[in-house]
């Protein structure tokens, strides 16, 4: 069964996934799909590495983790209830059927309306500004919510404040994590 | 293996367009990647210019937006460079190149020299 | 616009040498960057991406270091085939990415 991994509409999602490479920067291919994992490759790929980088990819969907120290966990930005579902994250381990494969299932809850304290409501507050910050392809803009422009060498940082630690602790804990080589 | 080569006119006159086309084998520009036009001045210096990701979308140098078009053919597997009222600024030898999520190159063309002048 | 600055235009090397191409950038890239070699009449090769990934098929004399601003590509015992012009590039900010303004290496 899949392990379960929960968040709010308009907020990031955080789906982890990791191995251990043979040696840093010496990479196995990963795909990410929405829908659990097929015999082979990913269905319906969100994002996909090759043996050095990001190749494919949409818009809101990022590895932010050190991915090539292992850790592909998948972020997604600014997630709808459409968003909910089961996520497949596939390690391509070269050799016949050698392909580690895990499957997330993914809850969006609806987000927590707070009522206002007075009849007059405070816009700003209800309401942050939303600003574009820069993410791992030129010109994509990814909304972190009401925050200052960020660059690359932020997101990591940023990413790891956003994610829940419980969860990526519950899929080291469940044996999610791999080792190559 | 992947390969690139760029094709167009070498000279061409100021107030006039250039276009240039790259042509892509060994994979296909729909597939994934960044691809991309830099170009190399006399000089050296190198400026990149904007890229097509393989899903259509574009971008570009702020420096050039006004001026500069990048648009693909996927059925030839090509895609192309428009710089609109170029002038001898724009000699230079273009570049059509692959790129990552993160836009550095892994494979480049072999460049053609365009010379802009009367 | 991020800069990026190789002060040595030149650098003289021998044979066997172990030569240091520097880069600095005007603020802080991470370790989004990239080397590249160019020789003449040549396009870029790549030969390091992430400031410290060798890029396949690129001799293990050559090394990439760095973080933030400061990176240098190293080249251990020069062959004569490296006699080259070297780039650096950021890739850390959108839309542009900016290359350095290179680095010729020449025989003493």
């Known amino acids: 069964s899949e392990v379960e991994y929960r968040a709010e509409v308009g907020q990031n999602a955080y789906l982890p996934c990791f191995y251990t490479p043979a040696a840093p920067g010496n990479l196995v291919p990963v795909c990410w799909g929405k829908g659990a994992c097929p015999v082979f490759e990913c269905g319906n790929v969100v994002l996909r590495t090759d043996e050095r980088d990001v190749n494919y990819w949409t818009s809101r969907y990022w590895l932010n983790g050190d991915f090539r120290k292992g850790d592909v966990s998948l972020t997604i930005e600014n997630v709808t209830l459409a968003d909910s579902g089961i996520y497949c994250c596939r390690i391509q381990i070269p050799g016949i059927m050698n392909d580690e494969k895990f499957n997330l299932k993914l809850v969006i809850k609806p987000a927590k309306v707070t009522p206002a304290p007075t009849r007059q409501r405070d816009f700003t507050a209800a309401f942050p500004r939303m600003l574009t910050t820069r993410g791992h392809g030129p010109a994509e803009t990814q909304t972190l919510g009401s925050l200052p422009d960020i660059n690359l060498t932020q997101i990591s940082t940023l990413a790891n404040e956003l994610r829940d630690s419980r969860l990526a602790n519950d899929l080291r804990d469940s044996g999610a994590t791999i080792r190559i080589g | 293996d992947v390969q690139l080569q760029e094709s167009g006119p070498d000279l061409v006159k100021p107030s006039q367009s250039l276009s240039l086309t790259c042509t892509v084998t060994?994979?296909?520009?729909?597939?994934?990647?960044?691809w991309h036009w830099i170009r190399q001045f006399p000089g050296n210096k190198l400026e990149w210019m904007g890229y097509i990701y393989f899903s259509g979308s574009t971008n570009y140098n702020p420096s050039l937006k006004s001026r500069i078009s990048i648009t693909r053919d996927t059925s030839k597997n090509q895609f192309f460079l428009q710089l609109n009222s170029v002038t001898t600024e724009d000699t230079a030898t273009y570049y059509c190149?692959?790129?990552?999520?993160?836009?550095?190159?892994?494979?480049w063309g072999q460049g053609t020299l365009v010379t802009v002048s009367a | 616009d991020i800069v990026m600055t190789q002060s040595q235009k030149f650098m003289s090397t021998s044979v066997g040498d172990r030569v240091s191409v520097t880069c600095k950038a005007s603020q802080n890239v991470g370790t989004n960057v990239a080397w590249y070699q160019q020789k003449p009449g040549q396009s870029p090769k790549t030969l390091i991406y992430?400031?410290?990934y060798r890029y396949s098929g690129v001799p293990d004399r050559f090394t990439g270091s760095g973080s933030g601003t400061d990176f240098t590509l190293t080249i251990s015992n020069v062959q004569s085939e490296d006699l080259a012009e070297y780039f650096c590039q950021q890739y850390n900010s959108y839309p542009l990415v900016t290359f350095g303004t290179g680095t010729k290496l020449e025989l003493k």
């Open positions: 992430s400031a410290s």
């Open positions: 190149a692959r790129g990552y999520r993160s836009a550095w190159f892994a494979y």
């Open positions: 060994g994979y296909s520009i729909t597939s994934g990647y960044s």
